[in-house]
């Protein structure tokens, strides 16, 4: 059984204010069963960026259809980028548990930074 890896290929992503940013995340295994969430930052204070199951994320869309049973692409798009969006973003796999899901593995993170405006 292959051990799950969380792949975030870009270490740094330069984005432009007002544009849409795509944060890539793929997994190498469908197991263990459980959701993938997106966070900004690390530690107790990390901010929830996207949770497929619940929440309000008006600027976030998924690249793939997460409801498909064999989906392994958990990439997201964040629209209307502002300077307040900079930071390091992590996709994190949770293992389904009762009563609560348990964090299983985190991706290495993608730092989103503002790039120069196109001339």
């Amino acid at each position: 059984e292959e051990e799950l890896q969380m792949i975030q290929p870009e270490k740094l992503l330069l984005v432009t204010v007002g544009k849409t940013a795509t944060l890539h995340c793929t997994v190498t295994s469908l197991l263990p069963v459980g959701p993938v969430l997106w966070f900004r930052g690390v530690g107790p204070g990390r901010e929830l960026i996207y949770n497929q199951k619940e929440g309000h994320f008006p600027r976030v869309t998924t690249v793939s259809d997460l409801t498909k049973r064999n989906n392994m692409d958990f990439s997201i798009r964040i629209s209307s980028i502002t300077p307040a969006d900079v930071g390091t973003y992590y996709c994190v796999k949770f293992r389904k548990g009762s009563p609560e899901n348990v964090e299983f593995k985190s991706g290495p993170g993608t730092e989103m930074a503002l790039g120069a405006k196109p001339s």
């Epitope: 969430l37 966070f39 900004r40 930052g41 530690g43 107790p44 204070g45 990390r46 901010e47 929830l48 960026i49 619940e54 929440g55 309000h56 994320f57 930071g87 609560e100 899901n101 964090e103």
Partner: antibody, heavy 117, light 108 residues
Framework: DVQLVESGGGLVRPGESLRLSCAAS????????VTWVRQAPGEGLEWVSL???????YYADSVKGRFTISRDNSKSTLYLQMNSLRAEDTAVYYC???????????WGLGTLVTVSS | EIVLTQSPGTLSVSPGERATFSCRAS??????LAWYQQKPGQAPRLLIY???TRATGIPARFSGSGSGTEFTLTISSLQSEDFAVYYC??????????FGGGTKVEIK
């Protein structure tokens, strides 16, 4: 505008219990960790407890086993259940929103808890 | 647990003057240090994080510097509304989140 409003403070005797509430508005409550910080009369700030977006809880050693932090995302409300209260728990209790940088960017006005016989 | 020590305990300054005070950490916190301002009867207000980044809406007269274990908050020209207590907080090693004991800036 971000608003945090604490309630539930008051005068209790040592050994008694109290539950504080903090009603949040002006931001997406479910997306942020929230925390309690207290300040004894004439003293500095002391971090008490934090609950993450996924519900993981953290406590200062001084309150571990006596205080319980919880959140109701459907009501955008943070709670602090305080049991076995001691005189040294007397303080103004503030709730605060936590940023992804692990700093506290918005604070309520606080609620005073007095523990005295 | 990281212990933060602020000095001086009280600083007497005249309006318009420069005020500088420090925060020392018991072990390195990199650049992960924040500063808060608290006026009597009010809640604390975030001023600076990451040692030198001003929080939203904070005037340019407030500046932070330092890294590792030694940090400084400077108010370039004190206004009447700046007389308050200032606390530092480390945001690299949690829990617990720790604060310094505070520096009171009073009118000279």
């Amino acid at each position: 505008d971000v608003q945090l409003v604490e309630s539930g403070g008051g005068l209790v005797r040592p050994g008694e219990s109290l539950r504080l509430s903090c009603a949040a508005s002006g931001f997406t409550f479910t997306n942020y960790a929230v925390t309690w910080v207290r300040q004894a009369p004439g003293e500095g700030l002391e971090w008490v407890s934090l609950i993450s977006v996924t519900g993981t809880t953290y406590y200062a050693d001084s309150v571990k086993g006596r205080f319980t932090i919880s959140r109701d995302n459907s009501k955008s409300t943070l709670y602090l259940q305080m049991n076995s209260l001691r005189a040294e728990d007397t303080a103004v209790y503030y709730c605060a929103k936590v940023t992804w940088k692990n700093v506290f960017d918005y604070w309520g006005l606080g609620t005073l808890v007095t523990v005295s016989s | 647990e990281i212990v933060l020590t602020q000095s001086p305990g009280t600083l007497s300054v005249s309006p318009g003057e420069r005020a500088t005070f420090s925060c020392r950490a018991s072990q390195t916190v990199g650049s992960k240090l924040a500063w808060y301002q608290q006026k009597p009867g009010q809640a604390p207000r975030l001023l600076i994080y990451d040692a030198n980044t001003r929080a939203t809406g904070i005037p340019a007269r407030f500046s932070g510097s330092g890294s590792g274990t030694e940090f400084t908050l400077t108010i370039s020209s004190l206004q009447s509304e700046d007389f308050a207590v200032y606390y530092c907080q480390q945001h690299t090693d949690w829990p617990p989140y720790t604060f310094g004991g505070g520096t009171k800036v009073e009118i000279k």
